[in-house]
């Protein structure tokens, strides 16, 4: 047969199949069988989702389902020993104590395991001390806090807002700067979008409501007990003290209603300037401690949380490929949830439910994809990606060697005003073919194309008449895939009005109420706009795997590559003295730029003109564009963080959620001024210089002809 | 050397608007507060607002609030403070502070209204 | 807003004078007070911050001390050169506010 037959049996199996088998009334049934009872990694609950998804995808036609467990430390609040902050007086008494639960929402007054708000992996603890408020406890913030405004926030607690950045770096900065706990907020400014009403009766962040989440700064290690390999059945655990990422002060979350109690009678220095101040009717005054009468009162933390080894369950669905089943594109969704999931994660999952049904109802007509689809409901990832980064270091001598691409598929929304894709560069040309040939949801474009609504409202900054793509960060399933192993990753969504609502996330995020209803009478009725997500995220799967060439544009690449290299240039030509002193130069990455430049270029004319009918040339060609990504992966990782290998693109530092460029210059650029040996400084940025250019010249011979 | 350089003395009638600069060096210009203070003939120190360059955060003097603004200029290390419908009580001597704590300050800017 | 009252307004002393301005806050403050030398014709100077911490570089013959509402700033020996105006202020409130000055002058 030729590949075109084994691919498609009959005519009418094409991506138009795929795409008009995706129902919204499925996903939507989906989501409200996924969100009735909590899904808490390592419950039983989430032990029987998993099962009822492998005999789901049974069901639906994959060629095979199965459970791949692992045993990883997980974190939960002590149940008879519950965690709260208080303000006690002068003699120790509890003059006020935080919320011990958030009211639950009307309709789920019932349901059992709920878990409290907390911050997991938190130590346990019960300091008590003067408070400081960090703003969002970023770099900057703790910068303006020591040098400019002379605040020691060593043996203080700090109270920090949600927002900005990953709560993990949150309470990595507070450590460093010395604090002896964190306590994390909402506040209304970040979480309380004007003109809406809070939960039950919009989708705002009620008073008592609370974001959980887990504080870790593992930095892609995984499980914190067994760091690059898998958490199996004959795994060596480090002890508790050496376990990777764990924070080493209690930390806790509260509500605006409890933030309120305790930032009322803050007194100490002003803040700063206006962008420390939210949207409480308090002074935002950043302390030390209380003011007036109030002076002698203290804040004090009750901690009781536990790290518990606990076994977790993947679900790995296969759909062989009838051409090159050795040649693996992945689509994958967490399904643990920190209560009910109304969104994150399972407005994915049902979209990845949806996906795999439309899948399976081709292959039952006898349709195959040219490549194998994978397809997994990852678990734990709420505790720092444990799951989907288990299994991919089980697995990774398999994943290096045949993983074409990786499709996450966390949260279909965030938001309901356009569409929000991060990804790879590879990906641009083939995110942009498929939703051009998608319709628009959107009010006000009907008859028009995705690309057209997604242009319009999300304008990309560099190219006219383009949308924005964004670099892949962290906090997600594709970060050991893309960051760790170098496989090709993209990520859809649908998302708010960035310009228009400044808060950060969606304002129910890890709350008790991210609930079905949420989503159904607030975010998304008809479920149109998950159904545009199911089509994106489907389709970018659905060409991946049934491409006769893969769609991957490395001249893309190129684009990009110069852009980043500009960037970091004028960010070191900050400091012009010191580079002429150092004798730092760019040449070499800018020359290996340029050679990348001319060769992707001729591997695209190669690729316009090369013999697809012949199977072995078909497959030299592919192979070297799914290689491209693996290319600029450097073996030794970047400094302090091994699993972090992309030199390309990796977690910032300051911010796990956001993705930098040339991460290993940027952060031995950062802050260089302060350093105390400015020679060793400069070194080290004139290594990582070199680094990158060599990387990127070797990444761009990869492309060149073989021979 | 940390210097605040301010703009050049200024004078103007009723009703104008004017706009003194302050040239921060010898520090990293986006880790320190702005403020703008002026100080009438003979007389003490009234702060005006201030400005957090690494962002644009603001906060004034609600007595200067509807005529003040004070803007940053991140790649020259720059800061500004207009004031808008002078009137003869705004002659004074206007400094930039720079730190949350006053700690350096430039050598002051001379405005006078007068008709 | 927050009110500071200097005194004395003007303090005659010889070299060598152990000196004491104080500062009163209309409400409590905490320590979110700093005090500044202004000298004519020059613009103001840091001495203190947070109540008692000196300054980079200025003389251990300054020190500042209180809280809540009642500030003091000391100069252990009067040298020549500290013959000036010397102003408080308050941080814990927008808008900051200063003290109206305390002139030391020769006696």
């Known amino acids: 047969k030729s590949s075109n037959e084994a691919t498609n049996i009959t005519p009418k199996h094409n991506m138009k199949a795929f795409l008009d088998e995706l129902k919204a009334e499925n996903i939507k049934k989906f989501l409200y069988n996924f969100t009735q009872i909590p899904h808490l990694a390592g419950t039983e609950q989430n032990f029987q989702l998993a099962k009822q998804i492998q005999s789901q995808w049974k069901e639906f036609g994959l060629d095979s389902v199965e459970l791949a467990h692992y045993d990883v430390l997980l974190s939960y609040p002590n149940k008879t020993h519950p965690n709260y902050i208080s303000i006690i007086n002068e003699d120790g008494n509890e003059i006020f104590n935080t919320s011990l639960f958030e009211p639950p929402p009307p309709g789920y007054e019932n349901v059992s395991d709920i878990v409290p708000p907390f911050s997991a992996f938190s130590p346990q603890g019960m300091p008590e001390g003067d408070l400081v408020y960090v703003n969002y406890a970023r770099t900057e913030d703790f910068f303006k806090l020591e040098r400019d405004m002379k605040i020691n926030c060593s043996g203080k607690i700090v109270i920090a807002r949600y927002g900005k950045v990953f709560r993990g770096n949150k309470v990595k900065n507070a450590q460093l700067a010395g604090a002896k706990g964190v306590i994390l907020y909402s506040d209304p400014a970040d979480y309380f979008a004007p003109g809406v009403k809070s939960y039950p009766d919009g989708w705002n962040l009620p008073g008592g409501g609370v974001q959980r989440g887990n504080i870790l700064n593992l930095n892609g290690a995984g499980d914190p007990l067994t760091p690059g390999y898998p958490a199996n059945e004959y795994a060596y655990r480090r002890g508790i003290a050496e376990a990777v990422g764990l924070p080493s002060i209690p930390v806790h979350p509260i509500g605006y209603y409890d933030a309120q109690k305790l930032l009322e009678k803050m007194g100490g220095s002003a803040p700063p300037d206006s962008s420390w101040r939210g949207s409480l009717k308090v002074p935002y005054n950043v302390g030390p401690g209380f003011t007036g009468n109030f002076s002698t009162q203290k804040v004090k933390m009750h901690i009781h949380s536990t790290n518990e080894v606990t076994r977790i369950y993947n679900v790995i669905g296969t759909l062989r490929g009838a051409v090159e089943p050795d040649r693996y594109v992945i689509l994958g969704g967490h399904r643990d949830s920190w209560v009910f999931g109304g969104i994150d994660p399972q407005s994915g999952a049902a979209v990845v439910h949806e996906i795999v049904r439309s899948f399976g109802t081709l292959k039952k007509e006898g349709w195959r994809p040219r490549r194998t689809i994978l397809f997994a409901s990852w678990d734990a990832e709420e505790f720092g990606l444990l799951g989907s980064t288990e299994w991919a270091e089980e697995n990774s001598r398999l994943l290096q060697e045949r993983g074409v691409a990786y499709i996450n598929a966390d949260s279909s929304i965030e938001g309901n005003y356009t569409l929000r894709v991060d990804c790879t560069p590879l990906m641009y040309s083939l995110v942009h073919n498929l939703t051009k040939e998608l319709k628009s949801p959107d009010e006000g474009f009907e008859g028009k194309s995705l690309y057209e609504s997604w242009t319009k409202k999300s304008p990309s900054p560099e190219f006219s008449g383009m949308p924005r793509i964004s670099k892949l960060g962290s906090g997600n399933d594709f970060e050991v895939f893309f960051q760790r192993l170098g496989i090709a990753s993209g990520r859809a969504r649908y998302t708010k009005n960035w310009e228009t609502n400044k808060f950060s996330g969606y304002p129910l995020y890890h709350s008790v109420y991210e609930t079905y209803e949420l989503v159904e009478k607030f975010y998304d009725p008809m479920f149109k706009y998950h159904l545009t997500v199911a089509q994106v995220r489907g389709g970018m799967v659905f060409e991946l795997a049934n491409s006769i060439v893969l769609p991957f544009d490395c001249r893309d690449y190129a684009v990009v590559l110069r852009k980043y290299a500009d960037k970091i240039y004028s960010i070191s030509m900050k400091h012009p003295q010191e580079m002429k002193t150092y004798s730092v130069s760019f040449d070499s990455l800018f020359s290996a730029v340029k050679n990348f430049t001319e060769i992707a270029s001729k591997f695209s004319e190669r690729l316009q003109d090369f013999d697809k009918s012949n199977p072995i040339v078909l497959r030299m060609m592919n192979d070297q564009l799914m290689f491209l990504e693996r290319a600029f992966i450097d073996p030794l990782g970047l400094p302090d963080r091994p699993f972090y290998r992309h030199v390309i693109y990796a977690p910032s530092s300051h911010n796990k959620y956001a993705g930098e460029s040339f991460p290993g210059i940027y952060d031995a650029l950062f802050d260089i001024e302060s350093k105390v040996d400015p020679s060793k400084a400069w070194g080290e940025v004139k290594r990582q210089i070199y680094v990158a250019a060599f990387t990127v010249q070797a990444a761009a011979e990869t492309l060149s002809e073989v021979a | 050397e940390v210097q605040l350089v301010q703009s050049g003395a200024e004078v103007k009638k009723p009703g104008a608007s004017v706009k003194v600069s302050c040239k921060a060096s010898g520090y990293t210009f986006t880790e320190y507060t702005i403020h703008w203070v002026r100080q009438a003939p003979g007389k003490g120190l009234e702060w005006i607002g201030n400005?957090?360059?690494?962002?644009?955060?603001?906060t004034y003097n609600q007595k200067f609030e509807d005529r003040v603004t004070i803007t940053v200029d991140k790649s020259t290390s720059t800061a500004y403070m207009e004031l808008s419908s002078l009137r003869s009580e705004d002659t004074a001597v206007y400094y930039c502070a720079g730190g949350w704590t006053f700690d350096y300050w430039g050598q002051g800017t001379t405005v006078t209204v007068s008709s | 807003d927050i009110q500071m009252t200097q005194s004395p307004s003007t303090l005659s002393a010889s070299v060598g004078d152990r000196v004491t301005i104080t500062c009163k806050a209309s409400q409590d403050v905490g320590t979110a007070v700093d005090w500044y030398q202004q000298k004519p014709g020059q613009a103001p100077k840091l001495l203190i911050y947070?109540?008692?911490t000196r300054h980079t570089g200025v003389p251990d013959r300054f020190s500042g001390s209180g809280s809540g509402t009642d500030f003091t700033l000391t100069i252990s020996r009067l040298q020549p050169e500290d013959f000036a105006v010397y102003y408080c202020q308050q941080f814990t409130r927008y808008p900051l506010t200063f003290g109206q000055g305390t002139k030391v002058d020769i006696k």
């Open positions: 400005i957090n360059p690494n962002n644009g955060g603001t």
């Open positions: 947070w109540a008692s």
